[in-house]
Protein backbone atom coordinates (compact mmCIF):
# COMPACT_ATOMS: atom_id res chain seq x y z
CA UNK A 1 0.00 0.00 0.00
CA UNK A 2 1.24 3.49 -0.78
CA UNK A 3 0.30 6.89 0.49
CA UNK A 4 0.37 9.42 -2.28
CA UNK A 5 0.02 13.15 -2.53
CA UNK A 6 -1.40 13.98 -5.89
CA UNK A 7 -4.58 15.78 -6.87
CA UNK A 8 -5.70 17.13 -10.22
CA UNK A 9 -5.19 20.87 -10.53
CA UNK A 10 -8.41 21.39 -12.40
CA UNK A 11 -11.80 22.64 -11.35
CA UNK A 12 -15.10 23.07 -13.15
CA UNK A 13 -15.66 26.39 -14.91
CA UNK A 14 -16.90 29.09 -12.60
CA UNK A 15 -20.52 30.25 -12.97
CA UNK A 16 -21.18 33.74 -14.19
CA UNK A 17 -18.59 33.82 -16.94
CA UNK A 18 -21.15 34.21 -19.68
CA UNK A 19 -22.85 36.99 -17.78
CA UNK A 20 -19.60 38.87 -17.46
CA UNK A 21 -18.97 38.49 -21.15
CA UNK A 22 -22.42 39.62 -22.15
CA UNK A 23 -22.89 37.18 -25.01
CA UNK A 24 -22.20 33.48 -25.32
CA UNK A 25 -20.58 34.02 -28.70
CA UNK A 26 -17.88 36.15 -27.13
CA UNK A 27 -16.65 33.31 -24.93
CA UNK A 28 -15.18 31.37 -27.84
CA UNK A 29 -12.79 34.09 -29.02
CA UNK A 30 -11.47 34.51 -25.48
CA UNK A 31 -10.96 30.79 -25.05
CA UNK A 32 -9.23 30.57 -28.41
CA UNK A 33 -7.08 33.58 -27.61
CA UNK A 34 -5.88 32.11 -24.34
CA UNK A 35 -5.34 28.76 -26.06
CA UNK A 36 -3.15 30.45 -28.63
CA UNK A 37 -1.25 32.49 -26.08
CA UNK A 38 -0.67 29.73 -23.53
CA UNK A 39 -0.18 26.82 -25.88
CA UNK A 40 3.47 26.40 -25.00
CA UNK A 41 3.15 26.81 -21.23
CA UNK A 42 4.94 23.89 -19.58
CA UNK A 43 4.26 22.52 -16.13
CA UNK A 44 5.94 20.34 -13.56
CA UNK A 45 4.23 17.69 -11.45
CA UNK A 46 5.53 16.23 -8.23
CA UNK A 47 4.42 13.08 -6.45
CA UNK A 48 5.64 12.09 -3.00
CA UNK A 49 5.00 8.58 -1.75
CA UNK A 50 5.88 6.78 1.43
CA UNK A 51 6.51 3.07 1.05
CA UNK A 52 4.36 0.98 3.38
CA UNK A 53 7.08 -1.64 3.63
CA UNK A 54 9.60 0.89 4.92
CA UNK A 55 7.73 3.74 6.59
CA UNK A 56 10.84 5.89 6.61
CA UNK A 57 11.46 5.39 2.89
CA UNK A 58 10.15 7.95 0.43
CA UNK A 59 9.82 7.94 -3.33
CA UNK A 60 9.66 11.29 -5.10
CA UNK A 61 8.55 11.30 -8.70
CA UNK A 62 8.60 14.40 -10.86
CA UNK A 63 7.69 15.05 -14.44
CA UNK A 64 7.82 17.84 -16.95
CA UNK A 65 4.80 18.58 -19.11
CA UNK A 66 6.22 20.60 -21.94
CA UNK A 67 7.48 20.25 -25.45
CA UNK A 68 11.02 21.49 -24.83
CA UNK A 69 14.05 19.32 -24.25
CA UNK A 70 15.05 18.86 -20.63
CA UNK A 71 18.65 19.77 -19.94
CA UNK A 72 18.80 19.32 -16.15
CA UNK A 73 16.65 18.25 -13.20
CA UNK A 74 17.42 19.23 -9.63
CA UNK A 75 15.59 17.59 -6.71
CA UNK A 76 15.78 19.33 -3.36
CA UNK A 77 14.07 19.19 0.00
CA UNK A 78 13.14 21.75 2.62
CA UNK A 79 12.10 24.27 -0.02
CA UNK A 80 12.96 25.32 -3.56
CA UNK A 81 16.48 24.91 -4.86
CA UNK A 82 18.47 28.04 -4.10
CA UNK A 83 15.91 29.33 -1.60
CA UNK A 84 16.73 27.38 1.52
CA UNK A 85 16.37 23.97 -0.03
CA UNK A 86 19.04 21.28 0.10
CA UNK A 87 19.89 19.48 -3.12
CA UNK A 88 19.32 15.73 -3.07
CA UNK A 89 20.07 14.90 -6.69
CA UNK A 90 20.99 16.47 -10.00
CA UNK A 91 20.08 14.53 -13.12
CA UNK A 92 21.39 15.29 -16.56
CA UNK A 93 19.74 13.40 -19.40
CA UNK A 94 23.07 12.43 -20.96
CA UNK A 95 25.95 13.32 -18.67
CA UNK A 96 24.77 11.31 -15.70
CA UNK A 97 23.27 11.51 -12.24
CA UNK A 98 24.63 12.96 -9.03
CA UNK A 99 22.95 12.21 -5.71
CA UNK A 100 23.65 12.83 -2.04
CA UNK A 101 22.44 11.28 1.20
CA UNK A 102 19.74 10.52 2.09
CA UNK A 103 19.07 9.93 -1.62
CA UNK A 104 19.49 6.24 -2.35
CA UNK A 105 18.64 5.98 -6.02
CA UNK A 106 17.88 8.68 -8.55
CA UNK A 107 16.92 7.65 -12.04
CA UNK A 108 15.16 8.72 -15.19
CA UNK A 109 11.80 6.99 -15.54
CA UNK A 110 11.01 8.42 -18.96
CA UNK A 111 12.54 11.17 -21.08
CA UNK A 112 10.51 13.70 -19.12
CA UNK A 113 10.15 12.20 -15.64
CA UNK A 114 12.48 11.12 -12.87
CA UNK A 115 12.23 9.26 -9.59
CA UNK A 116 14.25 9.46 -6.42
CA UNK A 117 14.23 7.01 -3.54
CA UNK A 118 15.19 8.38 -0.13
CA UNK A 119 16.25 6.12 2.69
CA UNK A 120 14.97 7.36 5.98
CA UNK A 121 17.35 6.41 8.71
CA UNK A 122 19.56 8.73 10.69
CA UNK A 123 19.54 12.45 11.27
CA UNK A 124 19.15 13.34 7.62
CA UNK A 125 15.97 11.33 7.09
CA UNK A 126 12.91 13.31 5.97
CA UNK A 127 9.92 13.83 8.21
CA UNK A 128 6.56 12.80 6.85
CA UNK A 129 5.71 16.23 5.52
CA UNK A 130 9.02 17.64 4.41
CA UNK A 131 8.68 19.67 1.24
CA UNK A 132 10.32 18.20 -1.85
CA UNK A 133 10.93 20.29 -4.94
CA UNK A 134 11.80 19.40 -8.51
CA UNK A 135 13.31 21.95 -10.84
CA UNK A 136 13.38 21.23 -14.56
CA UNK A 137 15.63 23.29 -16.77
CA UNK A 138 14.53 22.98 -20.36
CA UNK A 139 15.12 24.61 -23.69
CA UNK A 140 13.53 26.88 -24.71
CA UNK A 141 11.14 27.25 -21.77
CA UNK A 142 13.68 28.01 -19.05
CA UNK A 143 13.46 26.70 -15.49
CA UNK A 144 10.27 25.40 -13.91
CA UNK A 145 9.97 24.20 -10.35
CA UNK A 146 7.18 22.52 -8.41
CA UNK A 147 7.09 21.38 -4.82
CA UNK A 148 5.05 18.96 -2.80
CA UNK A 149 5.04 16.76 0.24
CA UNK A 150 3.23 13.81 1.71
CA UNK A 151 -0.19 14.72 3.13
CA UNK A 152 -1.19 13.66 6.65
CA UNK A 153 -1.98 9.94 6.39
CA UNK A 154 -5.16 10.56 8.38
CA UNK A 155 -6.72 12.24 5.37
CA UNK A 156 -8.23 9.44 3.26
CA UNK A 157 -9.38 11.83 0.56
CA UNK A 158 -5.88 12.26 -0.79
CA UNK A 159 -5.27 8.71 -1.89
CA UNK A 160 -4.61 8.76 -5.61
CA UNK A 161 -4.44 5.98 -8.16
CA UNK A 162 -1.28 3.89 -7.80
CA UNK A 163 0.35 5.30 -10.92
CA UNK A 164 0.06 8.78 -12.40
CA UNK A 165 -0.21 7.40 -15.93
CA UNK A 166 -2.81 10.00 -16.93
CA UNK A 167 -0.14 12.64 -16.52
CA UNK A 168 2.11 11.13 -19.12
CA UNK A 169 -0.73 10.26 -21.43
CA UNK A 170 -2.05 13.78 -21.14
CA UNK A 171 1.36 15.13 -22.01
CA UNK A 172 1.46 13.02 -25.16
CA UNK A 173 -2.06 14.01 -26.03
CA UNK A 174 -1.11 17.62 -25.52
CA UNK A 175 1.88 17.37 -27.79
CA UNK A 176 0.18 15.36 -30.54
CA UNK A 177 -3.40 16.54 -30.46
CA UNK A 178 -3.33 20.18 -29.51
CA UNK A 179 -1.26 21.37 -32.45
CA UNK A 180 -4.08 20.79 -34.94
CA UNK A 181 -6.75 22.18 -32.65
CA UNK A 182 -4.69 25.29 -31.96
CA UNK A 183 -3.96 25.88 -35.59
CA UNK A 184 -7.63 25.67 -36.44
CA UNK A 185 -8.55 27.73 -33.37
CA UNK A 186 -6.10 30.51 -34.12
CA UNK A 187 -7.25 30.72 -37.73
CA UNK A 188 -10.86 30.80 -36.58
CA UNK A 189 -10.03 33.46 -34.01
CA UNK A 190 -8.46 35.65 -36.65
CA UNK A 191 -11.56 35.15 -38.76
CA UNK A 192 -13.81 36.18 -35.86
CA UNK A 193 -11.71 39.19 -35.03
CA UNK A 194 -11.80 40.37 -38.62
CA UNK A 195 -15.57 39.96 -38.64
CA UNK A 196 -15.96 41.89 -35.39
CA UNK A 197 -13.80 44.66 -36.78
CA UNK A 198 -16.60 45.64 -39.13
CA UNK A 199 -19.37 45.84 -36.53
CA UNK A 200 -19.68 47.90 -33.32
CA UNK A 201 -18.25 46.12 -30.31
CA UNK A 202 -20.83 45.14 -27.67
CA UNK A 203 -20.34 46.77 -24.29
CA UNK A 204 -19.04 44.43 -21.64
CA UNK A 205 -20.66 44.46 -18.23
CA UNK A 206 -18.18 45.46 -15.56
CA UNK A 207 -17.04 42.49 -13.53
CA UNK A 208 -18.24 42.16 -9.99
CA UNK A 209 -15.34 39.97 -9.03
CA UNK A 210 -12.47 42.15 -10.09
CA UNK A 211 -12.41 45.94 -10.28
CA UNK A 212 -9.05 45.62 -12.03
CA UNK A 213 -10.41 43.95 -15.14
CA UNK A 214 -9.10 46.64 -17.49
CA UNK A 215 -5.60 45.69 -16.38
CA UNK A 216 -6.08 42.16 -17.58
CA UNK A 217 -2.99 40.44 -18.86
CA UNK A 218 -3.42 38.55 -22.10
CA UNK A 219 -0.95 35.87 -21.01
CA UNK A 220 -3.02 34.56 -18.15
CA UNK A 221 -3.95 30.96 -18.85
CA UNK A 222 -7.57 29.97 -18.85
CA UNK A 223 -9.15 26.84 -17.53
CA UNK A 224 -10.09 25.83 -21.03
CA UNK A 225 -6.54 26.10 -22.27
CA UNK A 226 -5.23 23.98 -19.47
CA UNK A 227 -7.89 21.36 -19.97
CA UNK A 228 -7.18 21.20 -23.65
CA UNK A 229 -3.44 20.90 -23.24
CA UNK A 230 -3.05 18.37 -20.49
CA UNK A 231 -4.14 17.50 -17.00
CA UNK A 232 -1.62 19.07 -14.68
CA UNK A 233 -1.37 17.56 -11.22
CA UNK A 234 -0.99 19.68 -8.15
CA UNK A 235 0.70 18.28 -5.10
CA UNK A 236 -0.67 19.06 -1.68
CA UNK A 237 1.79 20.30 0.88
CA UNK A 238 1.67 20.46 4.62
CA UNK A 239 5.18 21.31 5.60
CA UNK A 240 6.72 20.23 8.86
CA UNK A 241 8.99 23.25 8.55
CA UNK A 242 6.71 26.19 7.75
CA UNK A 243 9.59 28.59 8.28
CA UNK A 244 11.26 27.18 5.23
CA UNK A 245 8.27 28.07 3.15
CA UNK A 246 7.97 31.54 4.63
CA UNK A 247 11.55 32.30 3.72
CA UNK A 248 11.40 30.71 0.31
CA UNK A 249 11.27 34.05 -1.48
CA UNK A 250 12.57 36.85 0.69
CA UNK A 251 13.22 39.16 -2.22
CA UNK A 252 9.71 40.26 -2.94
CA UNK A 253 9.07 40.97 -6.56
CA UNK A 254 6.70 38.76 -8.53
CA UNK A 255 6.12 36.14 -5.86
CA UNK A 256 2.45 35.62 -5.17
CA UNK A 257 1.70 32.88 -2.68
CA UNK A 258 -1.35 31.22 -4.09
CA UNK A 259 -2.13 28.72 -1.40
CA UNK A 260 -4.59 26.35 -2.94
CA UNK A 261 -7.65 24.59 -1.61
CA UNK A 262 -7.00 20.88 -1.37
CA UNK A 263 -9.65 19.91 -3.91
CA UNK A 264 -8.32 21.89 -6.84
CA UNK A 265 -6.04 24.59 -8.05
CA UNK A 266 -7.75 27.88 -8.76
CA UNK A 267 -7.12 29.31 -12.20
CA UNK A 268 -8.08 32.64 -13.70
CA UNK A 269 -11.15 31.95 -15.78
CA UNK A 270 -11.92 34.81 -18.09
CA UNK A 271 -10.83 38.34 -18.75
CA UNK A 272 -12.54 39.56 -15.63
CA UNK A 273 -10.45 37.28 -13.48
CA UNK A 274 -7.11 38.06 -15.05
CA UNK A 275 -5.92 40.54 -12.46
CA UNK A 276 -3.65 38.87 -9.93
CA UNK A 277 -5.44 38.38 -6.66
CA UNK A 278 -3.81 36.16 -4.05
CA UNK A 279 -5.99 33.31 -2.86
CA UNK A 280 -6.53 33.04 0.90
CA UNK A 281 -4.00 30.73 2.50
CA UNK A 282 -5.31 27.25 3.14
CA UNK A 283 -2.10 25.51 4.13
CA UNK A 284 -1.36 23.85 0.84
CA UNK A 285 0.29 25.05 -2.31
CA UNK A 286 1.40 24.35 -5.82
CA UNK A 287 4.30 26.19 -7.30
CA UNK A 288 5.84 26.81 -10.65
CA UNK A 289 8.91 28.80 -11.47
CA UNK A 290 9.86 30.22 -14.80
CA UNK A 291 13.41 31.48 -14.85
CA UNK A 292 14.96 32.51 -18.13
CA UNK A 293 18.50 31.65 -19.12
CA UNK A 294 21.07 34.31 -18.46
CA UNK A 295 21.56 35.12 -22.12
CA UNK A 296 18.04 36.48 -22.34
CA UNK A 297 19.05 39.05 -19.74
CA UNK A 298 15.63 39.63 -18.27
CA UNK A 299 12.71 37.86 -16.71
CA UNK A 300 9.61 37.09 -18.71
CA UNK A 301 6.61 39.36 -18.25
CA UNK A 302 4.64 36.48 -16.77
CA UNK A 303 5.22 33.68 -14.36
CA UNK A 304 3.78 30.62 -15.91
CA UNK A 305 0.39 29.12 -15.41
CA UNK A 306 -0.95 31.29 -12.62
CA UNK A 307 0.53 29.34 -9.74
CA UNK A 308 2.98 30.12 -6.98
CA UNK A 309 6.25 31.51 -8.26
CA UNK A 310 9.58 30.74 -6.70
CA UNK A 311 11.89 33.43 -8.03
CA UNK A 312 15.50 32.38 -7.96
CA UNK A 313 17.19 34.65 -5.41
CA UNK A 314 20.33 34.56 -7.54
CA UNK A 315 18.48 35.99 -10.50
CA UNK A 316 18.06 34.20 -13.80
CA UNK A 317 20.91 31.84 -13.04
CA UNK A 318 22.25 29.87 -15.94
CA UNK A 319 23.36 26.32 -15.84
CA UNK A 320 27.00 25.65 -16.41
CA UNK A 321 28.20 23.74 -19.37
CA UNK A 322 27.36 23.51 -23.02
CA UNK A 323 23.73 22.49 -22.59
CA UNK A 324 23.08 25.47 -20.40
CA UNK A 325 24.07 29.01 -21.07
CA UNK A 326 27.37 30.00 -19.62
Amino acid sequence: MRTEAQVPALQPPEPGLEGAMGHRTLVLPWVLLTLCVTAGTPEVWVQVRMEATELSSFTIRCGFLGSGSISLVTVSWGGPNGAGGTTLAVLHPERGIRQWAPARQARWETQSSISLILEGSGASSPCANTTFCCKFASFPEGSWEACGSLPPSSDPGLSAPPTPAPILRADLAGILGVSGVLLFGCVYLLHLLRRHKHRPAPRLQPSRTSPQAPRARAWAPSQASQAALHVPYATINTSCRPATLDTAHPHGGPSWWASLPTHAAHRPQGPAAWASTPIPARGSFVSVENGLYAQAGERPPHTGPGLTLFPDPRGPRAMEGPLGVR
Epitope: R98, E320, G321, R326
Partner: antibody
Framework: EVQLVQSGAEVKKPGSSVKVSCKAS????????IEWVRQAPGQGLEWMGE????????NYNEKFKGRVTITADESTSTAYMELSSLRSEDTAVYYC???????WGQGTLVTVSS | DIVMTQSPDSLAVSLGERATINCKSS????????????LAWYQQKPGQPPKLLIY???TRESGVPDRFSGSGSGTDFTLTISSLQAEDVAVYYC?????????FGQGTKLEIK
Protein backbone atom coordinates in the same frame (compact mmCIF):
# COMPACT_ATOMS: atom_id res chain seq x y z
CA GLU B 1 33.77 30.49 -18.69
CA VAL B 2 34.19 28.09 -15.77
CA GLN B 3 37.74 27.90 -14.44
CA LEU B 4 39.27 25.79 -11.71
CA VAL B 5 42.63 26.84 -10.26
CA GLN B 6 44.44 24.48 -7.91
CA SER B 7 47.12 25.05 -5.30
CA GLY B 8 50.78 24.33 -5.96
CA ALA B 9 52.84 21.15 -5.73
CA GLU B 10 53.51 19.61 -2.32
CA VAL B 11 56.16 17.29 -0.90
CA LYS B 12 55.03 15.35 2.14
CA LYS B 13 56.39 12.79 4.57
CA PRO B 14 54.72 9.39 4.95
CA GLY B 15 52.08 9.45 7.68
CA SER B 16 51.40 13.16 7.28
CA SER B 17 48.43 14.90 5.61
CA VAL B 18 48.05 17.12 2.57
CA LYS B 19 45.32 19.62 1.77
CA VAL B 20 44.84 20.63 -1.85
CA SER B 21 42.64 23.59 -2.79
CA CYS B 22 40.57 24.25 -5.91
CA LYS B 23 39.22 27.74 -6.54
CA ALA B 24 36.29 28.00 -8.94
CA SER B 25 35.29 31.01 -10.99
CA UNK B 26 32.54 31.43 -13.55
CA UNK B 27 29.20 29.71 -13.03
CA UNK B 28 27.47 29.26 -9.71
CA UNK B 29 29.74 27.55 -7.20
CA UNK B 30 26.98 25.92 -5.19
CA UNK B 31 25.05 24.50 -8.14
CA UNK B 32 27.23 21.58 -9.16
CA UNK B 33 29.51 19.20 -7.36
CA ILE B 34 33.28 19.47 -7.30
CA GLU B 35 34.91 16.11 -8.04
CA TRP B 36 38.37 14.99 -7.02
CA VAL B 37 40.32 12.59 -9.23
CA ARG B 38 43.89 11.43 -8.85
CA GLN B 39 46.43 10.01 -11.28
CA ALA B 40 49.54 8.21 -10.16
CA PRO B 41 52.60 8.61 -12.45
CA GLY B 42 52.03 6.67 -15.67
CA GLN B 43 48.73 5.33 -14.35
CA GLY B 44 45.04 5.84 -15.03
CA LEU B 45 42.42 8.08 -13.45
CA GLU B 46 40.88 7.29 -10.07
CA TRP B 47 37.83 9.07 -8.64
CA MET B 48 38.21 9.95 -4.97
CA GLY B 49 35.02 11.75 -4.08
CA GLU B 50 32.88 14.84 -4.54
CA UNK B 51 31.20 17.64 -2.67
CA UNK B 52 28.12 19.72 -3.43
CA UNK B 53 29.19 23.13 -2.11
CA UNK B 54 25.68 24.47 -1.48
CA UNK B 55 24.87 21.82 1.11
CA UNK B 56 28.33 20.41 1.83
CA UNK B 57 26.98 16.97 0.95
CA UNK B 58 29.73 14.53 0.03
CA ASN B 59 30.25 11.18 -1.65
CA TYR B 60 33.48 9.23 -1.28
CA ASN B 61 35.09 6.32 -3.03
CA GLU B 62 35.10 3.43 -0.52
CA LYS B 63 38.81 2.97 -1.20
CA PHE B 64 39.59 6.35 0.35
CA LYS B 65 36.90 6.50 3.06
CA GLY B 66 38.37 7.46 6.39
CA ARG B 67 41.47 8.98 4.79
CA VAL B 68 39.98 11.64 2.56
CA THR B 69 37.94 14.66 3.61
CA ILE B 70 36.41 16.99 1.04
CA THR B 71 35.17 20.40 2.14
CA ALA B 72 34.08 23.62 0.50
CA ASP B 73 34.00 27.29 1.40
CA GLU B 74 31.19 29.04 -0.44
CA SER B 75 32.43 32.50 0.54
CA THR B 76 35.64 31.99 -1.45
CA SER B 77 34.25 29.51 -4.01
CA THR B 78 36.98 27.10 -3.01
CA ALA B 79 36.88 23.34 -2.50
CA TYR B 80 39.46 21.40 -0.51
CA MET B 81 40.61 17.80 -0.53
CA GLU B 82 42.56 16.57 2.47
CA LEU B 83 44.25 13.18 2.38
CA SER B 84 45.69 11.84 5.62
CA SER B 85 48.02 8.98 6.59
CA LEU B 86 49.99 9.51 3.40
CA ARG B 87 52.05 6.70 1.95
CA SER B 88 54.39 6.57 -1.02
CA GLU B 89 51.70 5.16 -3.29
CA ASP B 90 49.70 8.37 -2.77
CA THR B 91 52.25 10.17 -4.93
CA ALA B 92 50.08 11.42 -7.76
CA VAL B 93 48.64 14.40 -9.55
CA TYR B 94 45.37 15.39 -7.88
CA TYR B 95 42.72 17.04 -10.04
CA CYS B 96 39.50 18.80 -9.21
CA UNK B 97 36.74 18.81 -11.82
CA UNK B 98 33.14 19.90 -12.10
CA UNK B 99 29.98 19.68 -14.16
CA UNK B 100 30.32 15.98 -14.89
CA UNK B 101 34.06 16.32 -15.53
CA UNK B 102 33.58 18.87 -18.29
CA UNK B 103 35.92 21.32 -16.53
CA TRP B 104 39.21 20.39 -14.85
CA GLY B 105 41.79 22.12 -12.71
CA GLN B 106 45.41 22.10 -13.86
CA GLY B 107 46.34 19.45 -11.31
CA THR B 108 48.43 19.43 -8.15
CA LEU B 109 51.41 17.10 -7.83
CA VAL B 110 51.72 15.60 -4.37
CA THR B 111 54.93 13.71 -3.73
CA VAL B 112 55.12 11.48 -0.66
CA SER B 113 58.70 10.73 0.20
CA SER B 114 60.75 10.15 3.31
CA ASP C 1 32.03 -1.08 -8.76
CA ILE C 2 31.64 -1.09 -12.53
CA VAL C 3 34.87 -2.19 -14.21
CA MET C 4 35.78 -0.47 -17.47
CA THR C 5 38.10 -2.33 -19.83
CA GLN C 6 39.61 -0.66 -22.87
CA SER C 7 41.18 -2.26 -25.92
CA PRO C 8 43.75 -2.05 -27.25
CA ASP C 9 46.17 -0.71 -24.63
CA SER C 10 48.06 1.11 -27.37
CA LEU C 11 47.36 1.89 -30.98
CA ALA C 12 49.45 3.24 -33.85
CA VAL C 13 47.59 4.76 -36.79
CA SER C 14 48.81 6.67 -39.85
CA LEU C 15 47.88 10.32 -40.25
CA GLY C 16 44.56 10.69 -42.02
CA GLU C 17 43.54 7.11 -41.19
CA ARG C 18 40.74 5.97 -38.93
CA ALA C 19 41.45 5.14 -35.29
CA THR C 20 39.09 3.00 -33.23
CA ILE C 21 39.20 2.46 -29.47
CA ASN C 22 36.87 0.03 -27.68
CA CYS C 23 35.52 0.11 -24.16
CA LYS C 24 33.62 -2.62 -22.35
CA SER C 25 31.80 -2.17 -19.04
CA SER C 26 31.11 -4.94 -16.51
CA UNK C 27 27.49 -3.72 -16.19
CA UNK C 28 25.12 -2.01 -18.59
CA UNK C 29 25.44 1.76 -18.71
CA UNK C 30 22.04 2.13 -20.35
CA UNK C 31 19.37 3.95 -18.40
CA UNK C 32 16.23 2.17 -19.55
CA UNK C 33 13.99 5.09 -18.52
CA UNK C 34 15.32 7.58 -21.04
CA UNK C 35 17.29 5.17 -23.24
CA UNK C 36 20.53 7.05 -22.65
CA UNK C 37 23.93 5.46 -22.12
CA UNK C 38 25.97 7.10 -19.41
CA LEU C 39 29.45 6.74 -20.83
CA ALA C 40 32.05 9.45 -21.42
CA TRP C 41 35.32 9.61 -23.36
CA TYR C 42 38.34 11.75 -22.41
CA GLN C 43 41.55 12.73 -24.13
CA GLN C 44 44.67 13.40 -22.08
CA LYS C 45 47.87 14.83 -23.46
CA PRO C 46 51.15 14.70 -21.49
CA GLY C 47 51.26 17.21 -18.64
CA GLN C 48 47.63 18.24 -19.10
CA PRO C 49 44.38 17.38 -17.35
CA PRO C 50 41.93 15.14 -19.19
CA LYS C 51 39.60 16.79 -21.68
CA LEU C 52 36.01 15.66 -22.09
CA LEU C 53 35.32 14.64 -25.69
CA ILE C 54 32.07 12.66 -25.64
CA TYR C 55 29.29 12.20 -23.10
CA UNK C 56 26.10 10.18 -23.25
CA UNK C 57 28.11 7.67 -25.35
CA UNK C 58 27.68 9.70 -28.53
CA THR C 59 27.22 13.43 -27.81
CA ARG C 60 30.24 15.57 -28.62
CA GLU C 61 31.25 18.11 -26.03
CA SER C 62 31.18 21.71 -27.21
CA GLY C 63 34.26 22.61 -29.24
CA VAL C 64 35.30 19.02 -29.97
CA PRO C 65 36.11 18.44 -33.68
CA ASP C 66 33.58 16.35 -35.56
CA ARG C 67 36.19 13.77 -36.51
CA PHE C 68 35.61 12.39 -32.99
CA SER C 69 32.53 10.26 -32.64
CA GLY C 70 31.20 7.85 -30.06
CA SER C 71 28.88 4.90 -30.47
CA GLY C 72 27.64 1.81 -28.69
CA SER C 73 25.07 0.87 -26.08
CA GLY C 74 24.73 -1.22 -22.96
CA THR C 75 28.19 -2.62 -22.25
CA ASP C 76 30.08 -2.11 -25.51
CA PHE C 77 31.26 1.29 -26.71
CA THR C 78 33.56 2.70 -29.35
CA LEU C 79 35.42 5.96 -29.84
CA THR C 80 36.29 6.65 -33.47
CA ILE C 81 38.61 9.28 -34.89
CA SER C 82 37.70 9.37 -38.55
CA SER C 83 40.89 10.99 -39.83
CA LEU C 84 43.80 11.05 -37.41
CA GLN C 85 45.58 14.38 -36.97
CA ALA C 86 48.97 14.94 -35.34
CA GLU C 87 47.35 16.73 -32.40
CA ASP C 88 45.25 13.65 -31.60
CA VAL C 89 48.25 11.84 -30.15
CA ALA C 90 47.20 11.27 -26.52
CA VAL C 91 45.87 8.74 -24.05
CA TYR C 92 42.11 8.15 -24.29
CA TYR C 93 39.94 7.06 -21.37
CA CYS C 94 36.37 5.86 -21.20
CA UNK C 95 34.36 6.46 -18.03
CA UNK C 96 31.29 5.01 -16.39
CA UNK C 97 28.95 7.90 -15.64
CA UNK C 98 26.08 5.56 -14.76
CA UNK C 99 26.62 4.76 -11.11
CA UNK C 100 28.83 5.47 -8.13
CA UNK C 101 31.73 5.46 -8.02
CA UNK C 102 32.54 6.89 -11.44
CA UNK C 103 35.17 4.53 -12.82
CA PHE C 104 37.62 4.96 -15.70
CA GLY C 105 39.13 2.55 -18.16
CA GLN C 106 42.85 1.91 -17.95
CA GLY C 107 43.49 4.11 -20.98
CA THR C 108 44.51 3.59 -24.61
CA LYS C 109 47.66 5.25 -25.88
CA LEU C 110 47.24 6.52 -29.43
CA GLU C 111 50.36 7.15 -31.50
CA ILE C 112 51.16 7.96 -35.11
CA LYS C 113 52.43 5.12 -37.25
Amino acid sequence: EVQLVQSGAEVKKPGSSVKVSCKASGGTFSSFSIEWVRQAPGQGLEWMGEILPGSNSTNYNEKFKGRVTITADESTSTAYMELSSLRSEDTAVYYCARYWFAYWGQGTLVTVSS
Amino acid sequence: DIVMTQSPDSLAVSLGERATINCKSSQSLLNSGNQKNYLAWYQQKPGQPPKLLIYGASTRESGVPDRFSGSGSGTDFTLTISSLQAEDVAVYYCQNAHSYPPTFGQGTKLEIK
